[in-house]
């Protein structure tokens, strides 16, 4: 009796269970009563990453330098090429088809997480006691200067954008 379902890594065709092609290989011919499934390796610029019955391998992704991309991991017959962005850029989307410059954190904000090839800069507002007076993709919020430790007094209070201004203690008292 012809099968209606097949084992794992097999497929049903012409009332027969045929072996799927292993990752890195494409289907040349289905099996018959007299022959096995025939598979062929993908060429150097192609891949298939699953057990399959594909008659064509997929092309490796191209990391286009004009879009700010570079190769992070070269593709094999079983894996696609992984692209990442050049220094100072990050992926625009999860599929990383193009890159955009990292965002800078404005004065009053510091870098919570430095950007990577795949994620943008994460900024956070400087809390009380901290400030950032620059627009930067690297600088964290810095703590206000401690005037006391320098035997000085606060002459001008700090803000989220400015440091405190310290001055000498008033000795006329």
């Amino acid at each position: 009796e012809p099968p209606t379902a097949c084992r794992e890594k097999q497929y049903l065709i012409n009332s027969q269970c045929c072996s799927l092609c292993q990752p890195g290989q494409k289907l040349v011919s289905d099996c018959t009563e007299f022959t096995e499934t025939e598979c062929l390796p993908c060429s150097e610029s192609e891949f298939l990453d699953t057990w399959n019955r594909e008659t064509r391998c997929h092309q490796h992704k191209y990391c286009d330098p004009n879009l700010g991309l570079r190769v992070q991991q070269k593709g094999t017959s079983e894996t696609d090429t992984i692209c990442t962005c050049e220094e100072g850029l990050h992926c625009m989307s999860e599929s990383c088809e193009s890159c955009v410059p990292h965002r800078s954190c404005l004065p009053g904000f510091g870098v919570k997480q430095i950007a990577t090839g795949v994620s943008d800069t994460i900024c956070e507002p400087c809390p009380v006691g901290f400030f950032s007076n620059v627009s930067s993709a690297f600088e964290k919020c810095r703590p206000w200067t401690s005037c006391e430790t320098k035997d000085l007094v606060v002459q001008q209070a700090g803000t989220n954008k400015t440091d405190v201004v310290c001055g000498p203690q008033d000795r006329q008292r």
Epitope: N14, V28, S29, T32, E33, F34, E36, L40
Partner: antibody
Framework: QVQLQQPGADLVKPGASVKMSCKAS????????ITWVKQRPGQGLEWIGD????????KYNEKFKSKATLTVDTSSSTAYMQLTRLSSEDSAVYYC?????WGQGTTLTVSS | DVLMTQSPLSLPVSLGDQASISCRSS???????????LEWYLQKPGESPKLLIY???NRFSGVPDRFSGSGSGTDFTLKISRVEAEDLGVYYC?????????FGGGTKLEIK
């Protein structure tokens, strides 16, 4: 019904080449491998090679690799086997087959 | 290459008798997928071979149930339970598990 039609006979001179045909009908040619087999007079069967009409993929018996070339013309549903540098040793009946169905065979005589 | 050895070379039988033909391979012919492509063919005088059994035990459509195939690994057998006149001819085993595919030398079934 499945049929593999081969010419009955061919007479060629030593040193020449011959291209034998095998016309398939009654099924989709591209789904089955075509097998070629040699049988010398009064002798047994010898596997020459196989071709898959869908992909053009071939398997050869090493012994026949420099003697036989298998091809297919899917537009005419015909498989071909070309034999080169013929000698009397090549005089035989040559069958094409789908394994479950066989052609009637072409009798090749190599003689001057 | 896998050598297929058939025995006996000639098998004289009386009509209605059981006949048994042995085929031994020089190495295990289970392929990498776990399948054994062992076939049996009958060739009558002046005709092309006809498939009887494929994959060791499977009877080809239209083949009478008096024909049965068995075996595994390196030892295979074709049995004809009650020989009829139309069964006479040369029987060949054939392995298509390991390239190059190979035929046995043949067993001639004849009347005693």
């Amino acid at each position: 019904q499945v049929q593999l039609q081969q010419p009955g006979a061919d007479l060629v001179k030593p040193g020449a080449s011959v291209k034998m045909s095998c016309k398939a009908s009654g099924y989709i040619l591209t789904t089955y491998w075509i097998t070629w087999v040699k049988q010398r007079p009064g002798q047994g069967l010898e596997w020459i090679g196989d071709i898959h009409p869908g992909s053009g993929s071939t398997k050869y018996n090493e012994k026949f690799k420099s003697k036989a070339t298998l091809t297919v013309d899917t537009s005419s549903s015909t498989a071909y086997m070309q034999l080169t540098r013929l000698s009397s040793e090549d005089s035989a009946v040559y069958y094409c087959a789908r394994r479950d169905y066989w052609g009637q065979g072409t009798t090749l005589t190599v003689s001057s | 290459d896998v050598l297929m050895t058939q025995s006996p070379l000639s098998l004289p039988v009386s009509l209605g008798d059981q006949a048994s033909i042995s085929c031994r391979s020089s190495q295990n012919i289970v392929n990498s997928q776990g399948n054994t492509y062992l076939e049996w063919y009958l060739q009558k005088p002046g005709e092309s071979p006809k498939l009887l059994i494929y994959k060791v035990t499977n009877r080809f459509s239209g083949v009478p149930d008096r024909f049965s195939g068995s075996g595994s690994g390196t030892d295979f057998t074709l049995k004809i339970s009650r020989v009829e006149a139309e069964d006479l001819g040369v029987y060949y085993c054939f392995q298509a598990s390991l390239v190059p595919w190979t035929f046995g030398g043949g067993t001639k079934l004849e009347i005693k």
